[in-house]
Interface confidence: low
């Protein structure tokens, strides 16, 4: 085992168990979590004479580690005087010791309050030449306190001389005012009046506000991804609830079922954003089967400062279905930039809106922030599309030049996933386009020969296709450009992807 | 495929400190998230912290917090968990893993798709 120094705990009573007529008083000292034996606990009694009794050390049973207590009894004015208890341990270093002082009982006492308050800014909205920050420590037992500003967590060096304290009744209070430049004001930087009182810590912060003014609490109920749905079959949904002012009141979310039928257990998080706000997210797991069949979940959020309860409900999307069209293909190179390589995936034509693009590589699904993908949005028709981006390394297409860009669809079939394999060199490429749709059609446009089979290899051109405008007359996505070989004497092929 | 091959396990008493190496003996890590898992004895193998393929966000198990860092060197293929104030409980094989389904599921042993042998961790 290594050798741990002791942590020295001081041992007292409450002053208010202590009869006004006691004689003599015990206090101890206790030191715990050291290695190896011995430690020595000498106490300073001032003035006072007192008997010490130092109980043998006990193993905790878990570390191994040794613990003992030593105990001092004082008779006398023992009251108004403070005693040190000090505990060396040789072991840890020769001159290692740990001085405690404190007095026989601990008071009850009411903690203080902190708060901090800043100048206005003038009628105009502006910051003047300088800001005022005021920390006021309120409501607490009359003692001892320390005030210390901190500058993003950072000691300030501050004239605490204009401190003042003020007693109404039972109870102080203090405050302490920190000028600032408007230029510190503005940089940004969080301000912290933080209190010592009692060996307790205290604090409240601030800083700029953000320059627009805060909107009101605002909530938000996500449906499943269809990659967590029918993939992964294990489906979640998510409450946020935004823009919450940091208090004292609870953040309540509550979930229910329209059947009536018991929810799983949620998971909470939340989160203080950059611009001093809170976000408060809970996350369900729902039954696959309960999903799909419809039922409807709702998400109820209530605070003490909101007027009322925020209501948010999702179920499944109605209306028609329609499975994602898939385009894969990817850039050629670029000057400078031989080690690297884009590759773009439309999806088209899908409804309802929801789905999950996924990019795959030797048969792995990549983490999602390899890839950047649109939001869905509408077409000129009534389906939706999306593009997803993805940077190659030269590293990873030598090792094996064929990507995939799968769409997790609810209407996609047969196992509700579409994809498409695209190669950085089409020529090169060892793999075919692992599709579970058909391969795309190549479009003859000559005399009766419509619609014949493309080889199944990625969405690349043919080698002597040239790009030209879509022409209505040309079967296919009318907003796809299309390629056309111009071979002579050859019935003209089109390619149905991106120019 | 990528191969992971962890090391930097052994006994320690309570209250000291490891540092756990997971580096790719076949393959790059570089574009990957890694996850590191754990397994006691007679327990399921759970989830202990993940970072991502960039390195600028992490994730950590309530258990850990505070005391486990997760960090990684893809220059040298490699992702370190340092293990500070170790408990008797943190006794486990301790697993490195790619993580197959990106940011969701991080926590889920069946979003990860290759696995390291393992290394013993022992706190006494």
């Known amino acids: 085992a290594s050798t741990q120094s002791p942590s020295v705990f001081p041992l007292t009573r409450c002053c208010k168990n202590i009869p006004s007529n006691a004689t003599s008083v015990t206090l101890g000292c206790l030191a715990t979590g050291y290695f190896p034996e011995p430690v020595m606990v000498t106490w300073d009694t001032g003035s006072l004479n007192g008997t010490t009794m130092t109980l043998p050390a006990t193993t905790l049973t878990l570390s191994g580690h040794y613990a003992t207590i030593s105990l001092l009894t004082v008779s006398g004015a023992w009251a108004k005087q403070m005693f040190t208890c000090r505990v060396a341990h040789t072991p840890s270093s020769t001159d290692w010791v740990d001085n405690k002082t404190f007095s026989v009982c601990s008071r009850d006492f009411t903690p203080p309050t902190v708060k901090i308050l800043q100048s206005s800014c003038d009628g105009g909205g502006h910051f003047p030449p300088t800001i005022q920050l005021l920390c006021l420590v309120s409501g607490y037992t009359p003692g001892t306190i320390n005030i210390t500003w901190l500058e993003d967590g950072q000691v300030m060096d501050v004239d605490l001389s204009t401190a003042s304290t003020t007693q109404e009744g039972e109870l102080a209070s203090t405050q302490s005012e920190l000028t600032l430049s408007q230029k510190h004001w503005l940089s940004d930087r969080t301000y912290t009046c933080q209190v010592t009182y009692q060996g307790h810590t205290f604090e409240d912060s601030t800083k700029k506000c953000a320059d627009s003014n805060p909107r009101g609490v605002s909530a938000y109920l996500s449906r499943p991804s269809p990659f967590d749905l029918f993939i992964r079959k294990s489906p979640t949904i998510t409450c946020l609830v935004v823009d919450l002012a940091p208090s004292k009141g609870t953040v309540n979310l509550t979930w229910s079922r329209a059947s009536g039928k018991p929810v799983n257990h949620s998971t909470r998080k939340e989160e203080k954003q950059r611009n001093g706000t809170l976000t408060v997210t809970s996350t369900l797991p729902v039954g696959t089967r309960d999903w799909i069949e419809g039922e409807t979940y709702q998400c109820r959020v209530t605070h003490p400062h909101l007027p009322r309860a925020l209501m948010r409900s999702t179920t499944k999307t109605s209306g028609p279905r329609a499975a994602p069209e898939v385009y894969a293909f990817a850039t050629p190179e670029w000057p400078g930039s031989r080690d690297k390589r884009t590759l773009a995936c439309l999806i088209q034509n899908f409804m309802p809106e929801d789905i999950s693009v996924q990019w795959l590589h030797n048969e792995v699904q990549l983490p999602d922030a390899r890839h950047s993908t649109t939001q869905p949005r509408k077409t000129k028709g009534s389906g939706f599309f999306v593009f997803s981006r993805l940077e190659v390394t030269r590293a990873e297409w030598e090792q094996k030049d064929e990507f995939i860009c799968r769409a997790v669809h609810e209407a996609a079939s047969p196992s509700q996933t579409v994809q498409r394999a695209v190669s950085v060199n089409p020529g090169l490429a060892g793999g075919s386009a692992q599709s579970q749709r058909a391969p795309d059609r190549v479009l003859c446009h000559s005399g009766q020969q419509q619609g014949l089979p493309r080889a199944a290899g990625g969405s690349v051109p043919h080698p002597r296709c040239h790009c030209g405008a879509g022409r209505a007359d040309w079967p296919g996505p009318p907003e796809l450009d299309v390629c056309v070989e111009e071979a002579e004497g050859e019935a003209p092929w089109t390619w149905t992807g991106l120019c | 495929d990528v191969q992971l091959q962890e090391s930097g396990g052994g006994l320690v008493q309570a209250g000291g400190s490891l540092k756990l190496s997971c580096a790719a003996s076949?393959?790059?890590?570089?574009?990957?998230?890694v996850a590191w898992f754990r397994q006691a004895p007679g327990k399921e193998r759970s989830f202990v912290t993940r970072?991502?393929?960039?390195?600028?966000?992490?994730y950590y198990a309530d258990a850990v917090k505070g005391r486990f860092a997760i960090s990684r060197d893809n220059a040298k293929n490699t992702v370190y968990l340092q293990m500070n104030s170790l408990k008797p409980e943190d006794t486990a094989v301790y697993y490195c893993?790619?993580?197959?389904?990106?940011?969701?599921?991080?926590?889920?042993?069946?979003?990860?798709?290759?696995w390291g042998q393992g290394t013993q961790v022992t706190v006494s």
């Open positions: 076949r393959g790059s890590l570089s574009r990957w998230d």
């Open positions: 893993a790619v993580a197959l389904y990106g940011n969701r599921g991080y926590y889920d042993v069946n979003a990860h798709s290759y």
């Open positions: 970072i991502s393929w960039s390195g600028t966000t992490s």
